[in-house]
Structures are given as structure tokens and as C-alpha cells.
Amino acid sequence: MMTGTIETTGNISAEKGGSIILQCHLSSTTAQVTQVNWEQQDQLLAICNADLGWHISPSFKDRVAPGPGLGLTLQSLTVNDTGEYFCIYHTYPDGTYTGRIFLEVLESSVAEHGARFQIP
């Protein structure tokens, strides 16, 4: 039975040209995290594997940085980066948990972080 929950940074906004940290946290389970995938819609950004370390998708290598922790840092943001991002946690023995973050990249200098929320 899957008892865990994924806490994410929720809806966030950032300035064009700036950077943002995408962060998820798995709680309420003793399951072992074996791998975390970061995806934008259906596009793979990066994978963090407990044994193999980080794989950054080649097309994002120059503007995606691993971390902090299991999170991901997006740099040199453009308006095209606006959209949904997913953290997919592979765990043992529970299976897969998915969290969602919505990022809005703003032209203006007014970019505030949204509230944190939980996805069961």
C-alpha cells in the first residue's frame, strides 16, 4: 500500500533570464527512493539515480543543473519554459509517486513564489 505523499513548491513564477529551483519531497513513507525523474510535459529533463548519479538530458545540459538534493535548477529561463513540471519518484517497495509543479516565467520583474501544497 502506498502511504507516501509528495510535497512540491506548487505554483511558482520567475523572471525571464533568471533561474528557479524545482523541488519535491516525499514524506509519510519508509520506502527507499531509487530514482527521481524530472519531466516537462512529456520531455525528460533529468534523472537522479541512487546508484548512478545524475543524467541530464543533452538538450538541456547547458541550462539545467542538478540539485539541490533531488531537486533541479533551471537557468536562463525563457517564456517558453512556462508550463507543468513533474517529479516522478521511483521507490521500493511502494512504486511510483508523482508530483506536479506549475512554473510561469514572467517578462516583468515581479515574480513571486506560490504557496507550497501537497499531492497525495
Epitope: T34, Q35, L44, I47, N49, A50, D51, L52, G53, H55, I56, S57, P58, S59, K61, D62, H90, Y92, T96
Partner: antibody, heavy 119, light 107 residues
Framework: QVQLVQSGAEVKKPGASVKVSCKAS????????MYWVRQAPGQGLEWIAF????????TYAQKFQGKATLTVDTSISTAYMELSRLRSDDTAVYYC????????????WGQGTLVTVSS | DIQMTQSPSSLSASVGDRVTITCRAS??????LSWYQQKPGKAPKLLIY???SLPSGVPSRFSGSGSGTDFTLTISSLQPEDFATYYC?????????FGQGTKVEIK
């Protein structure tokens, strides 16, 4: 097109070292990891290690920790694998391979380098 | 370590046959499995990644399926150039390991 060209065959004595090179072309070298795999005569494939050409960080199979050393020279888009303390059972064809776009698989392979260890 | 077991170790088939090779992982690897083709004296070539995705240039007669521990490579209509040895490989942990290979021979 993407190409990996490896250095030529080597014959070494037990206890010696060998350094195999892998020259990449047709893509941005630092965007991909380079993997090394070996195949003993008549046998299957065995993964040795990979190196992130961007950061220079390496990940090894435990069996090859201290045996293989991976390096890259990004200025000439070339990866290297040095094997130390060679034994007769290190006789094999050694392949370099570019990592995949979506994980730790091997997308494009070099032609292979035969390393023969014999006294 | 995750062990990969292929079956059969060899098979004989004719041109036009449908051929199926299976690969079993000793624990769940989700869909992190790739397949390679190797001809004698040549380097392996990637056929399938992430269990079912075909790289560009690989003929559509090759297909992959499965997830978790059980995977299949299917050649829908065997061609003369398909006689080779096929290997599976997981890409889910260290060490990355390959199956022992399946040799497809001419009947």
C-alpha cells in the same frame, strides 16, 4: 553523422598498463557521457564505467574500481580509458559508446579496440 | 546487482518468421531496458531503449515491450540481415548489466 573512432589494437604483457582512446565527431562532445564496455573472446558484454564529458565525473562498476581510469580531453573531443595491472583475462575487445539521450544506455558505439595480454 | 537473463540462448528461424526473445530482470527495473544487435566482428548497435522506443534508423519490424521484470524483443518478419546476436541491458542501477545474449541463426 555521429562517429566514434577508437585507437588500434594493443598487445601488452601481464602487469603492464594500456590506454585506449575514443575520438568523437558529429555532435557536441560535452553534452553526452562516454561509456566503456568490454567483450572477452566468444563472450558477452560487460560494462566497465562511464564519464560525464561535461563535468569529468566518472562512475565505475565495482569490479573495475582501481583497475580502469577514465578521462576526457574536451579540446579534441576524445575520451580515454586506462587499464592497469593487466592480466591474461583482461584480453578483450574494448568499446567506447556514447550515452543515450534519455538515460544510461549506449546510443552509438565505436568500432572496438582489441587488447591482448600475453607473456 | 540486477541480473538479466535472456531466453532462449539461441534459436533457428527462417526469413519471414516472427521471432521473440525474452529478457527477465532479477528485480523491477520499470521500463529501463535496452536491446542491442551485434553481428560477428562488429560493434553492437542500439535497437530499443526504455523498453519500447526505437531510435531513428531502426526498422519498424523491431519492437519492444514489457515493464517491471519481464521484457520482449520481437522481430515481426525476420530479414536476412537480422541474423545476429541480441543483448538486453538494464539502465536502472550500478552495475549496468547485460543479458548473456541470444543468437539468431538461419534454419
Amino acid at each position: 553523422q555521429v562517429q566514434l573512432v577508437q585507437s588500434g589494437a594493443e598487445v601488452k604483457k601481464p602487469g603492464a598498463s594500456v590506454k585506449v582512446s575514443c575520438k568523437a565527431s558529429g555532435y557536441t562532445f560535452t553534452r553526452y557521457s562516454m561509456y566503456w564496455v568490454r567483450q572477452a573472446p566468444g563472450q558477452g558484454l560487460e560494462w566497465i564505467a562511464f564519464i560525464d564529458a561535461y563535468s569529468g565525473g566518472s562512475t565505475y562498476a565495482q569490479k573495475f574500481q582501481g583497475k580502469a581510469t577514465l578521462t576526457v580531453d574536451t579540446s579534441i573531443s576524445t575520451a580515454y580509458m586506462e587499464l592497469s595491472r593487466l592480466r591474461s583475462d583482461d584480453t578483450a575487445v574494448y568499446y567506447c559508446a556514447r550515452g543515450g539521450d534519455y538515460g544510461w544506455y549506449l546510443g552509438v558505439w565505436g568500432q572496438g579496440t582489441l587488447v591482448t595480454v600475453s607473456s | 546487482d540486477i541480473q538479466m537473463t535472456q531466453s532462449p540462448s539461441s534459436l533457428s528461424a527462417s526469413v519471414g518468421d516472427r521471432v521473440t526473445i525474452t529478457c527477465r530482470a532479477s528485480q523491477s527495473i520499470y521500463s529501463y531496458l535496452s536491446w542491442y544487435q551485434q553481428k560477428p566482428g562488429k560493434a553492437p548497435k542500439l535497437l530499443i531503449y526504455n523498453a519500447k522506443s526505437l531510435p531513428s534508423g531502426v526498422p519498424s519490424r523491431f519492437s519492444g515491450s514489457g515493464s517491471g521484470t519481464d521484457f520482449t524483443l520481437t522481430i515481426s518478419s525476420l530479414q536476412p540481415e537480422d541474423f545476429a546476436t541480441y543483448y538486453c541491458q538494464h539502465h536502472y542501477g550500478n552495475p549496468l548489466t547485460f543479458g548473456q545474449g541470444t543468437k539468431v541463426e538461419i534454419k
